[in-house]
Each structure stands twice: as structure tokens, then as C-alpha cells.
């Protein structure tokens, strides 16, 4: 391709408008002033520049702002944001939630890209914590966002932000993540009454300890099997048959269908067969009658 540098006579851009889509790449480079582009970034989004042309415009901004774009430019990047690399974004200082929303909107409907992940990381680090408004925004665009964070990152979520979390936002969370989120949720919802509390806390119960499950069993919550199956195995094992029966209520019949799956399978192995028989579900695999159960972990603790 021919290398041309001087802007042809009469082609100097006085404003960013659709006439520029007729410019070749070299003409854009030569005829569009970077400062003009920066002040009229909001217009770029309305013009169907090709990706090639966008590369030129990006290059001009990079030259103007080698240390990173100011937020006034970032907020109006529009689909030029898709041309940014994570390295570019790491130079930015994004503090406005409106800027974040504007850029997430550009990527709407797509998987979370490395660019978006970097943008969110920069934004959250700049704020110091995941406040409720930020969490609201992020989970609206990416329901799985919360579960993409490490337990360490989740520790910066204040309990007040938990109110923004919807059940589907936790679908892909693993037990380690729920271990961090559950105590925050417990704190956030502590002033709610029994049934309302259970509705809110239910999605977080994969991080609940045994004593909290025992407490719930006294409140007629009727936990469904899907929730029960997500509980920590180590939290379920110490529950008695009576406690599980109270916890599940009418859903207790569902144990039969899950008897080969964790945590039900492991829980059955810990129960006396006599006690299991009281459920009338035909659950098998409990400790036979007359056998003595030694809790070796307790014995080790004593010695």
C-alpha cells in the first residue's frame, strides 16, 4: 500500500462526521486532528466506521494520550472500546459508574471479554470495594460475575451489597466462594423474620455451617432438594434424621431419588438404619442396629 502523509487539500476534518467514512486510512491519519477526535468522541459511535478505520482513530488517541485516556474520552468510546487491549485499559483510571455502564453496554450480549474483565478490575480496585451500585450494575450485565471472583476478592464485598445479589448470580459459585459470601448474607439479612429470611438466605446456604442448618431446621422452612444438594457435605453429616426431616419438611421424600449422590449418600452412611427407617422412604446403607459408632476425630482431640 502507498504510504502517504500529507492531508490532501480541502480534506482537513473540521468536525467528526459521516463524511470521514469515505476517507482512506492514510487520509484519516493525516487529516483528523487527535485533539478534535478527543473532544468529539461521542460522535464516533454514530458513524459506521470500519474496524480498519477505527484502528486509525485509536492510534491517534494513543499518540495523544500515551499515559492512558482521560475519563472524558473513555466515557464516549462507544464501540471503539472493542478495539482496546487489556494493556490499554490498565492505563485508565475509571471512577464513574456511568462510564462503566456505557462501556459494558457496548459489550452487551457477548461473553465477558478480557477487556471487560480488566475494565471491571480497574474500576473495583479504584473504588476499594464492591459497593452495592457497582454490584447491581455488574450482575445486571453479567449474572455470573460474582462467581468469577476469587474468595480473596469476594472478601471485599460489604454485607450491604449482598442485597443486590439475585439467586441466578450464584449459580456457578463453588463452595469456597459461598463460604465467603454466606456470613455476609447472614449479616445482611439478620433483621428479617423467619420465612423472609429463608427466601433471601437460601441461595447462599452452600456456605452454611452445621449449627446454622440445625437452627433452620427448627423454623419450618421446607428446604427444597435442589438447595439441600448444594449444602456442604461436612455441614450436613452431623445432622440427625429428625433435623433433616424438619429441614426438608414435605420435600424429605426427595431423599430417595438422591440417595446415591452427595451429600445424601454420605449422610446416610452416618445415620443409624433404625432412624432412617422412621422416614419410611426405604433409604438403605445406614449403620446396622447394635453397632457402636466411635467418633475417632473426637478421640484424637481428647488424647
Amino acid at each position: 500500500e502507498v504510504e502517504k502523509t500529507a492531508c490532501p487539500s480541502g480534506k482537513k476534518a473540521r468536525e467528526i462526521d459521516e463524511s470521514l467514512i469515505f476517507y482512506k486510512k492514510w487520509e484519516l491519519e493525516a487529516c483528523v486532528d487527535a485533539a478534535l477526535l478527543a473532544t468529539q468522541m461521542d460522535r464516533v459511535n454514530a458513524i459506521p466506521f470500519t474496524y480498519e478505520q477505527l484502528d486509525v482513530l485509536k492510534h491517534k488517541l494513543d499518540e495523544l494520550y500515551p499515559q492512558g485516556y482521560p475519563e472524558s474520552v473513555i466515557q464516549h468510546l462507544g464501540y471503539l472500546f472493542l478495539k482496546m487491549s487489556p494493556e490499554d485499559i490498565r492505563k485508565w483510571n475509571v471512577t464513574s459508574l456511568e462510564t462503566l455502564k456505557a462501556l459494558l453496554e457496548v459489550n452487551k450480549g457477548h461473553e465477558m471479554s478480557p477487556q471487560v474483565a480488566t475494565l471491571i478490575d480497574r474500576f473495583v480496585k479504584g473504588r476499594g470495594q464492591l459497593d452495592k451500585d457497582t454490584l447491581d450494575t455488574l450482575t445486571a450485565f453479567y449474572p455470573g460475575y460474582l462467581c468469577s471472583l476469587s474468595p480473596e476478592e469476594l472478601s471485599s464485598v460489604p454485607p450491604s451489597s449482598i442485597w443486590a445479589v439475585r439467586p441466578q448470580d450464584l449459580d456457578t459459585c463453588d463452595p469456597r466462594q459461598l463460604d465467603v459470601l454466606y456470613p455476609k448474607a447472614r449479616l445482611a439479612f439478620q433483621n428479617m423474620n423467619g420465612s423472609e429470611y429463608f427466601v433471601k438466605i437460601q441461595s447462599f446456604l452452600g456456605g452454611a455451617p452445621t449449627e446454622d442448618l440445625k437452627a433452620l431446621s427448627q423454623q419450618n422452612v421446607s428446604m427444597d432438594l435442589a438447595t439441600f444438594m448444594k449444602l456442604r457435605t461436612d455441614a450436613v453429616l452431623p445432622l440427625t434424621v429428625a433435623e433433616v426431616q424438619k429441614l426438608l419438611g414435605p420435600h424429605v421424600e426427595g431423599l430417595k431419588a438422591e440417595e446415591r449422590h452427595r451429600p445424601v449418600r454420605d449422610w446416610i452412611l452416618r445415620q443409624r438404619q433404625d432412624d432412617l427407617d422412621t422416614l419410611g422412604l426405604g433409604l438403605q446403607g445406614g449403620i446396622p442396629n447394635g453397632y457402636l459408632v466411635l467418633d475417632l476425630s473426637m478421640q484424637e482431640a481428647l488424647s
Epitope: 454514530a46 458513524i47 459506521p48 466506521f49 470500519t50 474496524y51 464501540y79 453496554e105 452487551k108
Partner: nanobody, 121 residues
Framework: EVQVVESGGGLVQPGGSLRLSCAAS????????GGWFRQAPGEQRELVAS???????KYADPVKGRFTISTDTAKNTVDLQMNSLGPEDTAVYYC???????????????WGQGTQVTVSS
């Protein structure tokens, strides 16, 4: 999957005419953006003509009055009628489609493979 396919290129004498046609599947030109670009040997690609409901019909200065872009919504094609052709119009002509986003702005772009137009006696 979106596909954009050009047809109608060929060899034509100076002063002659050609009609290029671009058919798209997986995207409708109606409500989006369709255009014709060209790239002459050793030159960068340039937009020749375009049309969209958002921006209307536009032409590059060198082809104004000679080229006409039109769309057939029933066939989902964008055609380029080229009259009074000269040697300077010799190039590979590319069809271009761009998605118009409902929330404003422009989404994915799609290019055809290109069709050669040669103007020579």
C-alpha cells in the same frame, strides 16, 4: 452464520457500464448498513457508496453522478450500478454490511470476498 457474496464484476471498456450485486444471508440490509468499497492496486480500501436508514445514501466524490446504490429488500441485496466507467475505476470491489444496534451505534461488520472490475480497452 453471516455471509456476504458479491457478483457482477468483469472486464468493461471505458465509458461502459456494470452492475454489481451483493447478497447477504444471516443479516438483513434493511435497517442496517450496506456499502461498496473498492481497493485499487497499491492503494488502501475506500468507500464508494453506502446506504442505511440512519444515514441515508452517500457517495464518494469521484463517483457522484455515475454510480447508484440501491437495495432490494425482498431479495436482501445491495446493488451498485456503475456508469461511465473509466480506467481509474479499476479495482477489487467489496460489499460491506454493518449491524445497526437497537441501542444506537454499530455492531459487527461483514465483508464479501471481493469482485474484480477492470476497465480497459
Amino acid at each position: 452464520e453471516v455471509q456476504v457474496v458479491e457478483s457482477g464484476g468483469g472486464l468493461v471498456q471505458p465509458g461502459g457500464s456494470l452492475r454489481l450485486s451483493c447478497a447477504a444471508s444471516g443479516i438483513t440490509f434493511s435497517g442496517n448498513y450496506g456499502g461498496w468499497f473498492r481497493q485499487a492496486p497499491g492503494e488502501q480500501r475506500e468507500l464508494v457508496a453506502s446506504m442505511s436508514s440512519a444515514l441515508g445514501t452517500k457517495y464518494a466524490d469521484p463517483v457522484k453522478g455515475r454510480f447508484t446504490i440501491s437495495t432490494d429488500t425482498a431479495k436482501n441485496t445491495v446493488d451498485l450500478q456503475m456508469n461511465s466507467l473509466g480506467p481509474e475505476d479499476t479495482a477489487v470491489y467489496y460489499c460491506y454490511a454493518r449491524v445497526r444496534l437497537s441501542r444506537g451505534g454499530w455492531g459487527s461488520e461483514y465483508w464479501g470476498q471481493g469482485t474484480q472490475v477492470t476497465v480497459s480497452s
